[in-house]
């Protein structure tokens, strides 16, 4: 089992849509794949993929997930808020008849405010 | 020490309800697939539920739809709750713990068992 | 349903000698992951099943070398290279490769 996630870095407007892909290789056949996306080690959803079906849609505040058979696993936030800045991280398991589990490597979201005054504060913020 | 305690089995009548408990201690509940086995009075093992470390179930379509199983990782707890029971339901009612984090479907440790009769 | 058949149905044996016992399943048990999932479980007197073999032929912990599991498919087969007398009890065979994961009916030990 491996993961492939992308982008490594994703810069959207506060408003905009964010698109968030997550590639699951299995070679062998699985009756349930688990995935999970997390934002900063905290988890968005953990849902199930039966039979080329997602068990939900939603994964945290406005986001919303797709499976595209054979691998793809898509979250898509829209709207964008600044809240929604942060690392993503994809994760996926198949449990039976063995626990064989995988994850992608981090996609880091930055939000731009619409303001762009509020942007430059934001930047000035920051030590150094 | 592993240890698995059932507790909840008694007599019930044909189309009622029972809650079996499964109190587990010795390991970090959180990291293994648990599971419920049933040995019915003079018979061999059957497989009746599982649970795996992040939720996910699966049983077996005789007891789909009768059958719930749950977990409380907080209370390092497994639970079953049974409804719609059958006389065919009569067993002892094992928890058994997955033989290790990656092992599911393979079970390692198992409690004493406890009595559930269906008759009226 | 996988239907695993386990022979004999009862075995006398005699301490210090050698022991077979025989599991066939209704299909093969190899996932599409290339493992095997067949197991072996003990159910002596008066207690709870306790794994002694996992995946074919990998002993649990703790349990003592004179147990071995073999086969490949559909055909399996536990040997005990010389019996003890704590070794009576129930053994059963169990696959975990397809869903609904089955046991056999169980092969009586018994001392002579």
């Known amino acids: 089992l491996s993961v492939q996630q992308g982008p490594n870095l994703l810069q959207v407007r506060q408003g905009s849509q964010a698109t968030l892909v997550c590639q699951v290789d299995q070679a062998t056949a699985w009756e349930r794949l688990r995935v999970k996306w997390t934002k900063d080690g905290a988890i968005l959803c953990q849902p199930y993929i039966t039979n080329g079906s997602l068990s939900l849609g939603v994964c945290g505040p406005q986001g919303r997930l797709s499976w595209q058979a054979p691998s793809h696993l898509t979250l898509q936030l829209d709207p964008v808020s600044l809240n929604h800045s942060g690392a993503y991280v994809c994760w996926a398991a198949v449990e039976i008849p063995e626990l064989e589990e995988a994850e992608g490597n981090i996609t880091r979201l930055f939000v731009d405010p619409d303001d762009p005054t509020q942007n430059r504060n934001r930047i000035a913020s920051f030590p150094g | 020490e592993v240890q698995l305690v059932e507790s909840g089995g008694g007599l019930v009548k044909p189309g009622g309800s029972l809650r079996l408990s499964c109190a587990a201690s010795g390991f970090t509940f959180s990291s293994y697939a648990m599971s419920w086995v049933r040995q019915a009075p003079g018979k061999g093992l059957e497989w009746v539920s599982s649970i795996s470390q992040g939720g996910g179930t699966y049983s077996p379509d005789s007891v789909k739809g009768r059958f719930t199983i749950s977990r409380d990782n907080a209370k390092n707890s497994l639970y079953l709750q049974m409804n719609s029971l059958r006389a065919e339901d009569t067993a002892v009612y094992y928890c058994?713990?997955?033989?290790?984090?990656?092992?599911?479907?393979?079970?390692?440790?198992w409690g004493q068992g406890t009595l559930v009769t269906v008759s009226s | 349903d996988i239907v695993m058949t386990q022979s004999p149905l009862s075995l006398p044996v005699t301490p210090g000698e050698p022991a077979s016992i025989s599991c066939r399943s209704g299909q093969s048990l190899v996932h599409s992951n290339a493992n095997t999932y067949l197991h072996w479980y003990l159910q002596k007197p008066g207690q709870s099943p306790q794994l002694l073999i996992y995946k074919v032929s990998n002993r649990f912990s703790g349990v003592p070398d004179r147990f071995s599991g073999s086969g490949s498919g559909t055909d399996f087969t536990l040997k005990i290279s010389r019996v003890e007398a704590e070794d009576v009890g129930v053994y059963y065979c169990?696959?975990?490769?397809?869903?609904?994961?089955?046991f056999g009916g169980g092969t009586k030990v018994e001392i002579k």
């Open positions: 058994a713990r997955g033989a290790d984090y990656y092992g599911t479907s393979w079970f390692g440790n």
């Open positions: 169990s696959q975990s490769t397809h869903v609904p994961w089955t």
